[in-house]
């Protein structure tokens, strides 16, 4: 008799896939440009990166580090009008794109949640999920809470409003602590909780030590749903050097949890190319055009439109693994078993049920190497077969679609490798 | 018990600006909302605007420029300033409370004041 | 701005008759997000303030007698009252109170009793 499939977990909508960060409209936008009514027509670009939501903003009213001229209610003007909002709303949910609005109060100001009237401050976020929440927004995000004091039970508060009005609406709350404890604390009080912080910021030195910060954090959360990311904002470039970018892609969209990218991360966006461009939010490269304070400074592959037309591009590979990410049983909500592969590599599977299962092996060291897997590791439930077959490489040159012996699997420099095989009884 | 009264001048004399006090008890202006709503002799009603616990106000956008509404906590008192009056504007003013999580309903109203515009 | 509309104007009934009083939203009143119906029915006596009955389109307010029923989604809704009592004449308001404001009043319907 055929064994009995395993129930499958209720999934929520941000269990399916990535988010995508806009925190500057104008920066995401260029070309002097920078509001909801010009982001309305961007969200076909999205869609194309197969995000499953949008966390905009913060686009509230709000004078530099002053509470009263501080509206979360108002739509700052620059950025558009409620109906500008509303509308961008309508055409985000035709195409299946959820929009989560950050109310970061003082975001143009020095303290976040400014550093007195902490109690009116909370009132206001209050007011601002209420009112949002019966406007249509799926979600919302509050930054820099290591800024706010008694910031879990604030946290515990404003979920209970949100999960009050739908189980289906999100809150994200965004440190930037790197601090495990800290963030466990955070964590503990508030469940459903969607946590970005800077956690796995310094994770880029070598792979036993990111394996030993992921598997860490995968046992201290237990069965909780995660976010990946570098940093509650921040650009992937930020902390990464460029021959790393793919490689993390690779992980962040195979690790178990959401995904939480920057806008400009699928690209390689890069600050400190672009000379005068704020390290934060520099301008979104969509073609050559985009940045034309320096003629000759961008070149086409740094642009969405020349990565566009080339398949081994990080665009790519971003759309690629955005896609696996959102339909693949075992990347959306499968089980996690992290396994020795030698020194310098991390390495994993992906599993659920009798699905087709994933095998993940990262390099993040400068030389190439033979990866020892140490099937030993894995439970039964996970074993390795001998033989899986290559989904991609984040390097060119490899023949996709191959089978590719285990035993023998050998490694570029920052290669990363998405292997598939099939469950066998 | 949830108590609201409005205390107004009676009578103003066109393009002159109207002050309408509303006083509650019984809860907090920290954690309600008050609406203020006019009715017109024998008429419907009209909603004119919100102001928040947190002290965001929504405005009916056909008479924004020459509402303001305001409030003091302390004091649990909340303001309707209307400026530039004409005799349309005569009506029964009322102040009531945003009473529901995730609705705009109003669950407790003062009694009104009647306000005249009238030379 | 959303247009609420009410019919009919006036109605007259004896006690005891049940009555159904109709209004209707220029755009629907649904909200997808939580599946609540933004639609207010509100009571108001002669010389009395309005007095909340329903929200969120058949969600009876505390304290109000049960021969109050609201129905409908979408654009179309209905106040019935079961049993008409001596004490329920009154103009009777619908409200929307979808998202944005103005949350705007239907033109009210008024209940007279033979």
């Known amino acids: 008799r055929a064994p009995r499939c395993r129930e499958l977990p209720a999934q929520k909508w941000w269990h399916t896939g990535a988010l995508y960060r806009i925190g500057d409209l104008q920066a995401f936008q260029g070309h002097g440009a920078g509001n909801l009514a010009g982001l309305k027509g961007r969200l076909d670009y999205l869609s194309s990166l197969k995000v499953k939501g949008l966390v905009l903003g913060p686009i509230h009213k709000n004078q530099k580090d002053d509470v009263a001229q501080t509206d979360l209610l108002q739509i700052d003007p620059n950025f558009g009008s409620k109906e500008d909002f509303d509308s961008l709303l309508q055409s985000a949910k035709k195409k299946s794109i959820r929009v989560i609005l950050d109310l970061t109060p003082n975001y143009r100001g020095e303290n976040s949640w400014f550093s007195t009237q902490v109690d009116t401050v909370a009132t206001k976020v209050k007011d601002a999920l209420e009112f949002w929440l019966q406007a249509g927004v799926d979600g919302f995000q509050v930054r820099d809470i290591e800024n706010l004091k008694d910031a879990s039970s604030f946290l515990a508060e404003w979920q209970n409003i949100t999960k009050g009005f739908s189980e289906d609406r999100l809150l994200i709350a965004g440190t930037n602590s790197s601090d495990l404890q800290q963030i466990l604390s955070l964590l503990e009080s508030n469940k459903d909780l969607l946590l970005t912080s800077s956690y796995l910021s310094d994770s880029g030195s070598t792979g036993e030590h990111t394996k030993s910060l992921v598997t860490q954090y995968l046992n201290a959360t237990g069965n909780r749903w995660c976010s990946w990311s570098l940093s509650q904002a921040r650009l992937l470039t930020s902390f990464l050097p460029a021959q790393l970018l793919r490689l993390y892609q690779l992980m962040l969209f195979t690790l178990p949890g959401t995904p939480v990218f920057s806008y400009g991360d699928e690209i390689g966006l890069d600050a400190a190319a672009l000379p005068g461009q704020p390290m934060e939010a520099p301008v979104m490269l969509w073609d050559e055009s985009s940045f034309p304070d320096i003629p000759g400074a961008v070149s086409a592959n740094m642009t969405v439109k020349g990565q566009s037309e080339d398949p081994g591009s990080l665009l790519s590979l971003f759309r690629r693994l955005s896609d696996q990410r959102s339909k693949e049983r075992s990347l959306l909500h499968g089980d996690f078993h992290a396994f020795s592969a030698g020194p310098g590599l991390f390495s994993y599977i992906r599993h659920w049920d009798q699905n087709e299962r994933f095998l993940v092996v990262l390099n993040f060291g400068d030389v190439g190497l033979s990866a020892g897997l140490q099937a030993s590791d894995l439970p039964a439930s996970a074993s390795l077969p001998a033989k899986a077959d290559l989904l991609l490489s984040t390097q060119p040159g490899r023949e996709e679609g191959s089978p590719l012996e285990l035993e023998r699997l050998k490694l570029e420099p920052h290669e990363g490798l998405l292997l598939r095989f099939p469950y066998a009884a | 018990q949830v108590q609201l009264k409005e205390s107004g001048p009676g009578l103003v004399a066109p393009s002159q600006s109207l002050s309408i006090t509303c006083t509650v008890s019984?809860?907090?202006?920290?954690?309600?909302?008050v609406h203020w709503i006019r009715q017109p002799p024998g008429k419907g009603l009209e909603w004119l605007g919100l102001?928040?616990?947190?002290?965001?106000?929504n405005y009916n956008s056909a008479l924004m420029s020459r509402l303001s509404i305001s409030k003091d906590n302390s004091k649990s008192q909340v303001f309707l300033k209307m400026n530039s009056l004409e005799t349309e504007d005569t009506a029964m003013y009322y102040c009531?409370?945003?009473?529901?999580?995730?609705?705009?309903?109003?669950?407790?109203w003062g009694q009104g004041t009647s306000v005249t515009v009238s030379s | 701005d959303i247009v609420m509309t009410q019919s009919p104007s006036s109605l007259t009934v004896t006690a005891g008759e049940k009555v159904t009083m109709s209004c209707k939203s220029s755009?629907?009143?649904?909200?997808?997000?939580?599946?609540?119906?933004?639609l207010t029915w509100y009571q108001q006596k002669p010389g009395q303030p309005p007095k909340l009955l329903i929200y969120?389109?058949?969600t009876r307010e505390s304290g109000v007698p049960d021969r109050f029923t609201g129905s409908g989604s979408g654009t179309e809704f209905t106040l019935t009252i079961s049993s008409v009592q001596a004490e329920d004449l009154a103009v009777y308001y619908c409200?929307?109170?979808?998202?944005?404001?103005?949350?705007?009043f239907g033109g009210g319907t008024k209940l007279e009793i033979k």
């Open positions: 009531a409370r945003k009473g529901h999580m995730y609705s705009y309903a109003m669950d407790y």
């Open positions: 102001i928040w616990a947190g002290g965001s106000i």
């Open positions: 019984g809860f907090s202006l920290t954690s309600y909302g």
């Open positions: 969120w389109a058949s």
């Open positions: 409200q929307n109170d979808y998202s944005y404001p103005p949350w705007t």
């Open positions: 755009q629907s009143l649904l909200n997808s997000g939580n599946q609540k119906t933004y």
